[in-house]
């Protein structure tokens, strides 16, 4: 897994008029890290883990950079010619990565109303766009605007590549990103469902990274997919994740059922409490 820094900015227009403010989210190694609200950008650490390690300087710098990027994205949205009535969004996602072999990647992707229409490899400056004619029209429009803007401001995309990597390296150096594994706490509960049936729920919490297998087994054999309900894997605000799986079983057969958990190469089974 490479280390990664991901910036996600969204700006909106209503009836062709670009709205003030923007939404920005920053993820570090896939974890929510910073957030700016729509009206006033104040970079907020997502979770105590980020706040503890990085000082105010970081939030000030990120606030300044994200505010500038939000302003640029609003200008870009204003130049999209085919805006129709109603609400429209322009989203820019910028990602940079450092791989185990020390090679780097960085790219930016533009979405209009949720549809990808333009990407750029920031390291090489190569542009790519989907084949659809709408996407290509949008892409040429935005690309030409960005190109003119870059010529005026003398800022080129390799600067974005360098800046993103510089930030990522700074965070890695600060120790905020630890290549850690935090095992989940697993808790099994039961509740009455209907006469003769109970619902058993298996919850896993406080784990990192987010990849996990959680499922119910009967006599050691996994239940079919359609007999189980899964919750999404969600951040719990502490840099770790939580999820759950539930199924309905006959009362009196609890001892035949176990919750199976697999995470980062470790696995365990958990019985239903009697």
């Amino acid at each position: 897994e490479p280390h990664s820094l991901r910036y996600n900015l969204t700006v909106l227009s209503w009836d062709g008029s670009v709205q003030s403010g923007f939404l920005a989210e920053v993820h570090l190694d896939g974890q929510p890290f910073l957030r700016c609200d729509r009206q006033k950008c104040r970079a907020k650490p997502q979770g105590q883990w980020a706040e503890d390690v990085l000082g105010n300087k970081t939030w000030d710098r990120e606030t300044r950079d994200l505010t500038g990027n939000g302003k640029d994205l609003r200008m870009t949205l204003a130049h999209i010619k085919d805006q129709k009535e109603g609400l429209h969004s322009l989203q820019e996602i910028r990602v940079c990565e450092i791989h185990e072999d020390n090679s780097t990647r960085s790219s930016q992707h533009f979405y209009y109303d949720g549809e990808l229409f333009l990407s750029q490899n920031l390291e090489t400056e190569e542009w790519t766009m989907p084949q659809s004619s709408r996407a290509q029209t949008l892409a040429m429009n935005v690309r030409n605007f960005l190109k003119e803007d870059a010529m005026k401001t003398k800022t080129h995309y390799h600067a974005m590549h360098a800046d993103c990597l510089q930030e990522l390296r700074r965070y890695l150096k600060s120790g905020v990103v630890l290549r850690r594994t935090v095992p989940p706490m697993v808790n099994v509960t039961r509740s009455e469902a209907s006469e003769g049936n109970i619902t058993v729920t298996c919850r896993a919490s406080g784990f990192y990274p987010w990849n996990i297998t959680l499922s119910w087994r009967q006599d050691g054999v996994s239940l079919s997919h359609d007999t189980q309900q899964w919750g999404d894997v969600l951040p719990d605000g502490n840099g770790t994740y939580q999820t759950w799986v539930a199924t309905r079983i006959c009362q009196g057969e609890e001892q035949r059922f176990t919750c199976y958990m697999e995470h980062s190469g470790n696995h365990s089974t958990h019985p239903v409490p009697s």
């Epitope: 490479p2 090679s103 990647r105 190569e126 080129h156 390799h158």
Partner: antibody, heavy 115, light 108 residues
Framework: QVQLQESGPGLVKPSETLSLTCTVS?????????WNWIRQPPGKGLEWMGF???????KYNPSLKSRVTISRDTSENQFSLKLSSVTAADTAVYYC????????WGQGTTVTVSS | EIVLTQSPATLSLSPGERATLSCSAT???????FHWYQQKPGQAPRLLIY???NLASGIPARFSGSGSGTSYTLTISSLEPEDFAVYYC?????????FGQGTKLEIK
């Protein structure tokens, strides 16, 4: 029809600087793409040397970085390669090529480094 | 840098046979930045397949490409006499751009 044509001396003395130019016709080098230099020593594989992009950014292969310079002349729609302090190991066919997936190539020019 | 390793180094087949050439990378490559070239003696290389699976202009449909991550494949479904050449893979994900060492496809 996009065409690329390399030109420059076929013989360079050791320790001197190799200079080649690629003239592009049918497409403006400031419109798009990277404009690359790639070389191939006799009987060997291909080695990417570097590029100048449509925006004027240059990128080089770190194995050659201290010796290689790529520049462009937008008025002539040309880009050039300079490789300093050459040795016999720099004897190769030198190609210029367009793009990132190199869709157009020059026919190549053979450069021999020998005294 | 990302090192590309092609296998086999030499492939000996007869016209009409199917050829499968492999290219393996030391680090993950985005499929949109992966390409294949064909080179015949005394000629410049020619773009064969771009972005992993797209045929370049004028390339016959017997050529196809696939792959993702660190593993890519070039397939020639039924070899024609003019297909015997050297084939190179190339990545444009990250600087420096790199090529594989080549696979020589020769007549058996």
């Amino acid at each position: 029809q996009v065409q690329l044509q390399e030109s420059g001396p076929g013989l360079v003395k050791p320790s001197e600087t190799l200079s080649l130019t690629c003239t592009v016709s049918g497409y403006s080098i400031t419109s798009d793409y990277a404009w690359n230099w790639i070389r191939q020593p006799p009987g060997k594989g291909l080695e990417w040397m570097g590029f100048v992009s449509y925006s004027g950014t240059t990128k080089y292969n770190p194995s050659l970085k201290s010796r290689v310079t790529i520049s462009r002349d937008t008025s002539e729609n040309q880009f050039s390669l300079k490789l300093s302090s050459v040795t016999a190991a720099d004897t190769a066919v030198y190609y210029c090529a367009r793009g990132y997936g190199f869709d157009y190539w020059g026919q190549g020019t053979t450069v021999t480094v020998s005294s | 840098e990302i090192v590309l390793t092609q296998s086999p180094a030499t492939l000996s087949l007869s016209p009409g046979e199917r050829a499968t050439l492999s290219c393996s990378a030391t680090s993950s490559i985005s499929s949109i930045y992966f390409h294949w070239y064909q080179q015949k003696p005394g000629q410049a290389p020619r773009l064969l397949i771009y972005r992993t699976s797209n045929l370049a202009s004028g390339i016959p449909a017997r050529f196809s490409g696939s792959g993702s991550g660190t593993s890519y494949t070039l397939t020639i479904s039924s070899l024609e006499p003019e297909d015997f050449a050297v084939y190179y893979c190339q990545q444009g994900t990250t600087i420096p751009f790199t090529f594989g060492q080549g696979t020589k496809l020769e007549i058996k």
